[in-house]
């Protein structure tokens, strides 16, 4: 794995008010230690699928099986937890889907669906047909175990019917659930038979039981909530970027590096150079020059634009991203062709990223 000596001092000056590079909340898959987990890459028309974990290329091994659009992890351990991505490489573009894996005592997870269809859950009965409470939509109650990233909104539903119309109340860990039991309280939408908690925190973990009752009977259903705490992580670079490119002498070219980072990233574009006729320093490490970095004079550090290129511009260009936690590094090659040759974007050459890590 490459290391290098920098020609320039890379200590950065205080920056302009930085841009936020925020990962949108990915779907969370939960497995208990020792269990197997199977995830399907939710991307369409994928010619080739590559997988990464925490930004590092994921290959098959004795516990990880990659078959088509499926990732299987056998005998999961807590070390399998992390941010995963599958990238579908197509002939004209590529797309990446991110998801989290949390290996914990909770067994299942997923996002709760929106109440787009809640009205049909409120069932009116013929007034003569007295009836004890019953569930009207058990499909919406199948997922008992919910693993949700901290700060997300959680919704538990218990669609029911009965005559007279039953009432609904909620328990937490078997005891009456009061508004003062959590900061910000909670909402109960009786019309949709739902309990809603916004901005969940670790203290919200536990068992939530809906009790639905009328004078003819009582039914209940329990959900388990696990709040998955996010922790700071190293930058993650989108697989396949920057992409290899070619252009003719005098042409222009652009390299793009897509960065995902919770913490403020410092982006550098680096190229191998020669110093005193040598490509390597006395320590045996290659000389590298910082062409651009995020900071006061950089308009968009994720893009490196080269104009009026010469043959000397050919070579490897490295996008190196660092935050206070760690680093990530990927590179692409620029081919400079003589003027008579037609240039072409080498989109198909998106091999596994070359990580410094």
């Amino acid at each position: 794995r490459p290391s290098f000596s920098l020609v320039e001092d890379t200590t950065l000056e205080p920056e302009e008010p930085p841009t936020k590079y925020q990962i949108s909340q990915p779907e969370v898959y939960v497995a208990a230690p020792g269990e197997s987990l199977e995830v399907r890459c939710l991307l369409k028309d994928a010619a080739v699928i590559s997988w990464t974990k925490d930004g590092v290329h994921l290959g098959p091994n004795n516990r990880t099986v990659l078959i088509g659009e499926y990732l299987q992890i056998k005998g999961a351990t807590p070390r399998d937890s992390g941010l995963y991505a599958c990238t579908a490489s197509r002939t004209v573009d590529s797309e990446t889907w991110y998801f989290m894996v949390n290996v914990t005592d909770a067994i299942s997870s997923g996002d709760d669906e929106d109440d787009t269809d809640g009205a049909e859950d409120f069932v009116s009965e013929n007034s003569n047909n007295k009836r004890a409470p019953y569930w009207t939509n058990t499909e919406k109650m199948e997922k008992r175990l919910h693993a949700v990233p901290a700060a997300n909104t959680v919704k538990f539903r218990c669609p029911a019917g009965g005559n007279p119309m039953p009432t609904m109340r909620w328990l937490k860990n078997g005891k009456e659930f009061k508004q003062e039991h959590r900061i910000g309280g909670y909402k109960v939408r009786n019309q949709h038979w739902s309990l809603i908690m916004e901005s969940v925190v670790p203290s919200d973990k536990g068992n939530y039981t809906c009790v639905v009752e009328n004078e003819y009977g009582s039914i209940n259903h329990t959900y388990h909530l696990d709040v998955v705490e996010r922790s700071p992580h190293r930058p993650i670079l989108q697989a396949g970027l920057p992409a290899n490119a070619s252009t003719v002498v005098g042409g222009d070219v652009e390299f793009v590096c897509k960065v995902y980072s919770d913490a403020q990233p410092h982006i550098q574009w680096i190229k191998h150079v020669e110093k005193n006729g040598s490509k390597y320093g006395p320590d045996g490490l290659p000389y590298l020059k910082v062409l651009k970095h995020s900071g006061i004079n950089s308009s968009n550090a994720e893009v490196l634009a080269l104009f009026n290129v010469t043959e000397a511009d050919a070579g490897e260009y490295i996008c190196k991203v660092s935050n206070y936690i760690g680093q990530a590094n990927q590179s692409a090659w620029l081919t400079v062709l003589p003027k008579q040759q037609a240039p072409g974007r080498e989109k198909e050459i998106t091999a596994s990223p070359d990580y410094l890590e």
Epitope: F4, P17, S231, I325
Partner: antibody, heavy 113, light 106 residues
Framework: EVQLVQSGAEVKKPGASVKVSCKAS????????MHWVRQAPGQGLEWMGA????????NYNQKFKGRVTLTRDTSISTAYMELSRLRSDDTAVYYC??????WGQGTTVTVSS | AIQLTQSPSSLSASVGDRVTITCSAS?????MSWYQQKPGKAPKLLIY???NLASGVPSRFSGSGSGTDFTLTISSLQPEDFATYYC?????????FGQGTKLEIK
């Protein structure tokens, strides 16, 4: 369990150098910056610099550049901070920290003639 | 270097009180971290990336803010919360801390 274990307290004379070690365990040492922070008696926290063990990238606080040297030995998952030309106002507790949430127990360095 | 100024520098409060500590930056930042430190101990991360609660930290701690003004709030003080609190920016070199806010029992 993640642990950062630092070397023991040191007493040095002005002008001397001190080298503090920080041994990491429980996580992949090479994948995370190792930061060094110091705290003078009764004072606040001051960031000195950081080293990225995988490739030896280093960022220094300019205040200490020329006096502080950060190194690492990946074979034993240990980072080192050496401070030279010690002065009495370098008397402080020196911490190593990684990810912001892992901290060593601190190493007290006393500079006194 | 970006300077971080905390206010107040010291604060007396009682168990059960709601306490707010502010941190003002000399330049705009995207994120702020907050630490708690007790005498003779290493700092403990409370909040990272402005509002994310660190693992194992009670939910009575919360963080907010953007740009140059950031806040740490303790919704209901507990006896173990009496300590010194520091803000820190990890956005721009050199990384810097606030001067600290000492929270004492009234």
């Amino acid at each position: 369990e993640v642990q950062l274990v630092q070397s023991g307290a040191e007493v040095k004379k002005p002008g001397a150098s001190v080298k503090v070690s920080c041994k990491a365990s429980g996580y992949t040492f090479t994948n995370y910056w190792m930061h060094w922070v110091r705290q003078a008696p009764g004072q606040g926290l001051e960031w000195m610099g950081a080293i990225y063990p995988e490739n030896r990238d280093i960022n220094y606080n300019q205040k200490f550049k020329g006096r502080v040297t950060l190194t690492r030995d990946t074979s034993i998952s240990t980072a080192y901070m050496e401070l030279s030309r010690l002065r009495s106002d370098d008397t402080a507790v020196y911490y190593c920290t990684s990810r912001g949430d892992y901290w060593g127990q601190g190493t007290t360095v006393t500079v006194s003639s | 270097a970006i300077q971080l100024t905390q206010s107040p520098s010291s604060l007396s409060a009682s168990v059960g009180d709601r306490v707010t500590i502010t941190c003002s930056a000399s330049s705009g930042l995207s994120y702020m971290s907050w630490y708690q430190q007790k005498p003779g101990k290493a700092p403990k991360l409370l909040i990272y990336d402005t509002s994310n609660l660190a693992s194992g930290v009670p939910s009575r701690f919360s963080g907010s803010g953007s740009g140059t003004d950031f806040t740490l709030t303790i919704s209901s003080l507990q006896p173990e919360d009496f300590a010194t609190y520091y803000c820190q920016q990890w956005s721009s070199y050199p990384y810097t801390f606030g001067q600290g806010t000492k929270l004492e029992i009234k």
